[in-house]
């Protein structure tokens, strides 16, 4: 039965004579007259078993004391701590030749735990042990026992166990305690890696490399390693582990993030609070769930707040100009918490009799700058049909609109287009050019948009650059322009007029008058 005594965490006791209750029962040689087991009281009045010998009067002493077999437990080097008292020979009368003040310490490795006899020649000497403090008769009277402590180590060991032996050669000794232990680097956690109990190396200068294993809920960042030194101290930690997603370091372990917190990646960061408009309902969340009506876009980081689609644009104003419409609006009151807001325009052509019967406008309508993904709050829509009802919807969209499209995100306006002016004339020709006149002809516009009431011809000398121009009007699709200067370049433009107004002028036609009459056909390019 062994009583527990507290020793350093890096020492593993193989034998402790003070912890044994009852007799030690070690083997002495000779059986009598040499080492003797004696029970004494320690400083706390607890009985302890000691071995004593004091044959100082007789010469040639050779008293051996051998311990029981001591298991090695995988240790390659063991330490022997001996606490003893030793009588000062000078304090003993008549023993000058025979009294000694040292004893010898031996060991013998063996796989046999039942060896009954001491074979001196099997034992290997560890050291001669001398006392730093010896006591005299006066000390005994004062009950002052001067306790010596000596530690020796032995190794490398290789067999299953060993025996220790103490050889007395004529001293007055009491072995108060014998403790045999080995050193280990105790189980420890460093950088979230656990390093197991590790027995020190065989050599007093050796380092044992140990690979650590990541604690629960963590993973290796760099391979965790440490070195176990001969003194049982861990040295030079290398590498580390990181807590997994959903976990953070707390007191050397990786604990699940609390409810309301999350951690998206394996990092050394702590868990973070769920971003605005999100929550976690379990411990160990790697991301937070968005509140109802809030969303996270595909490229949003887990750390970003959950957001929602914007509200409708405000203050939509329309301005109809014949078959064009200019729309302007203000940003929504609520952007949904996002910066990536843009606008889409939806155009619907509606029947005059029944506004509910609307159809998409189709590809003939043009939008400036564009129909979708508008970053500005205005758009110009052209090439609409005259006298037609149109409904325009302006949709505010952001990165999460696709998750919850709703009419609440748009504003609409219905307009009716006016009579449209005619389109421009595509082809103007010079049919005949003389010294003083040019005969012009042209085609009707592609889109007259009504009855053409007249055409207007504008012309001017090229080098006057439109500063001084003249106008000729005609109902026909041709006219003779007279009173021109010879050998002069003129520029001609033609436009049509309906009840809705004038269309755009044609592309310029450049003609140079001649010195002699001639008939030339021009097509809107230069003519001579």
């Amino acid at each position: 039965v062994t009583g527990s005594r507290v020793y350093p965490a890096n020492e593993v006791t193989l034998l402790d004579s003070r912890s044994v209750q009852g007799e030690l029962g070690w083997i002495a040689s000779p059986l009598e007259g040499g080492w003797e087991e004696v029970s004494i009281m320690d400083e706390k009045n607890t009985p302890i078993r000691t071995y004593q010998v004091c044959n100082v009067m007789e010469p040639s002493q050779n008293n051996w004391l051998r311990t029981d077999w001591i298991t090695r437990e995988g240790a390659q080097r063991v330490y022997i701590e001996i606490k003893f008292t030793l009588r000062d020979c000078n304090s003993l009368p008549g023993v000058m030749g025979t009294c000694k003040e040292t004893f010898n310490l031996y060991y013998y490795e063996s796989d046999n735990d039942k060896e009954r006899f001491i074979r001196e020649n099997q034992f290997v000497k560890i050291d001669t042990i001398a006392a730093d403090e010896s006591f005299t008769q006066v000390d005994i009277g004062d009950r002052i026992m001067k306790l010596n402590t000596e530690i020796r180590d032995v190794g490398p060991l290789s067999k299953k166990g060993f025996y220790l032996a103490f050889q007395d050669v004529g001293a007055c000794i009491a072995l108060v305690s014998v403790r045999v232990f080995y050193k280990k680097c105790p189980l420890t956690v460093r950088n979230l890696a656990q390093f197991p109990d590790t027995i020190t190396g065989a050599d007093t200068s050796s380092l044992v490399e140990v690979r650590g294993s990541c604690v629960n809920n963590s993973e290796e960042k760099d391979v965790p390693k440490m070195y176990c030194g001969a003194d049982g101290e861990w040295l030079v930690p290398i590498g580390n582990c990181l807590c997994n997603a959903g976990h953070e370091e707390r007191s050397g372990e990786c604990q699940a993030c609390k409810i309301g917190y999350y951690k998206a990646l394996s990092t050394d960061a702590t868990c973070a609070k769920c971003p605005p408009h999100s929550y976690s309902v379990w411990e160990g969340a790697t991301s937070c769930t968005c509140d109802r009506g809030f969303f996270r876009a595909d490229n949003d980081a887990a750390s970003m707040p959950c957001t929602r689609p914007p509200s409708a644009p405000l203050n939509l104003i329309s301005n109809v100009n014949e078959t064009s419409v200019n729309l302007e609006w203000s940003s929504p009151q609520n952007t949904g918490g996002r910066q990536d807001i843009s606008y889409n325009v939806v155009c619907k052509k509606c029947g005059a009799g029944d506004p509910s019967k609307c159809r998409p406008c189709g590809s003939g309508v043009h939008y400036t700058p564009q129909q979708n993904g508008l970053k500005t709050t205005k758009v110009s829509i052209t090439d609409l049909l005259a006298h037609t009802n149109y409904t325009f919807e302006i949709w505010a969209v952001n990165g999460v609109s696709k998750y919850n499209p709703s009419p609440d995100q748009s504003v609409s306006v219905t307009v009716t287009t006016n009579q449209a002016a005619p389109s421009s004339i595509a082809l103007v020709q010079a049919k005949e050019v003389t010294r003083y006149s040019v005969a012009l002809a042209w085609l009707e516009p592609d889109r007259p948009n009504g009855v053409i009431l007249e055409y207007e011809v504008k012309y001017y000398e090229k080098d006057q650059n439109e500063r001084s121009y003249r106008i000729v009007r005609t109902a026909a699709r041709n006219t003779d322009i007279k009173g021109l200067n010879p050998l002069t370049s003129y520029v001609f433009h033609v436009r049509a007029r309906t009840a809705a107004g004038y269309g755009d002028f044609s592309e310029p036609l450049e003609v140079t008058t001649n010195t002699v009459p001639s008939r030339i056909i021009g097509d809107g390019a230069n003519s001579t």
Epitope: N216, S251, E253, K258, I259, Y261, K273, E283
Partner: antibody
Framework: QSVEESGGRLVTPGTPLTLTCTVS????????MSWVRQAPGKGLEWIGI?????NTYSANWAKGRFTISKTSTTVDLKITSPTTEDTATYFC????????????WGPGTLVTVSS | YVMMTQTPSSVSAAVGGTVTINCQAS????????LAWYQQKPGQRPKLLIY???TLASGVPSRFKGSGSGTEFTLTISDLECADAATYYC?????????FGGGTKVEIK
Amino acid sequence: QSVEESGGRLVTPGTPLTLTCTVSGFSLSSYHMSWVRQAPGKGLEWIGIIYRSGNTYSANWAKGRFTISKTSTTVDLKITSPTTEDTATYFCARESSTFYGMDLWGPGTLVTVSS
Amino acid sequence: YVMMTQTPSSVSAAVGGTVTINCQASQSVYGNNELAWYQQKPGQRPKLLIYRASTLASGVPSRFKGSGSGTEFTLTISDLECADAATYYCLGYKSDDYTFGGGTKVEIK
């Protein structure tokens, strides 16, 4: 769900004393448990915590003076070598899974250290 | 390790009045808001009032209001009742450690 401390009594200085906290209605494998003490007429003082993993952590001032351990339904606080300054009511409290703090407390047990 | 300084140490107010208790942390608490408030009456266990600085615990009247962030926190008790006479403690968490404030004794006149 409840927590109850026991084991408080009069002890002489230096005599180790173990307090026991018995829990019911929840599992110690799901919650961390703390010990808190309150000297007569004084404020609350956090001693330490045992995590659901079984690992422990103590306030700096408490290291070496207290040992926390647990079984499946109890948490023990051992006062290793009591002094008169350790006279107090000792509370066992459950750490919340929702926030950092204690959400369930025992009624406390009184320890008196006197020679 | 975070230190919690609670002020005042005692305060007296009339029924129906308002009391404000301050708690200052020596450094930002975990998450900037991991601070709880407890009420303790003589001979009783502490009772949780507020957690995460401002969230009211279940069953606690809305007369109790917590606010603050980082290092400065406040507990406000309005419409005081006789039953509010107690000692109030703040509890902060940071880097594995919990620390209680020194307590504020509230007396009702």
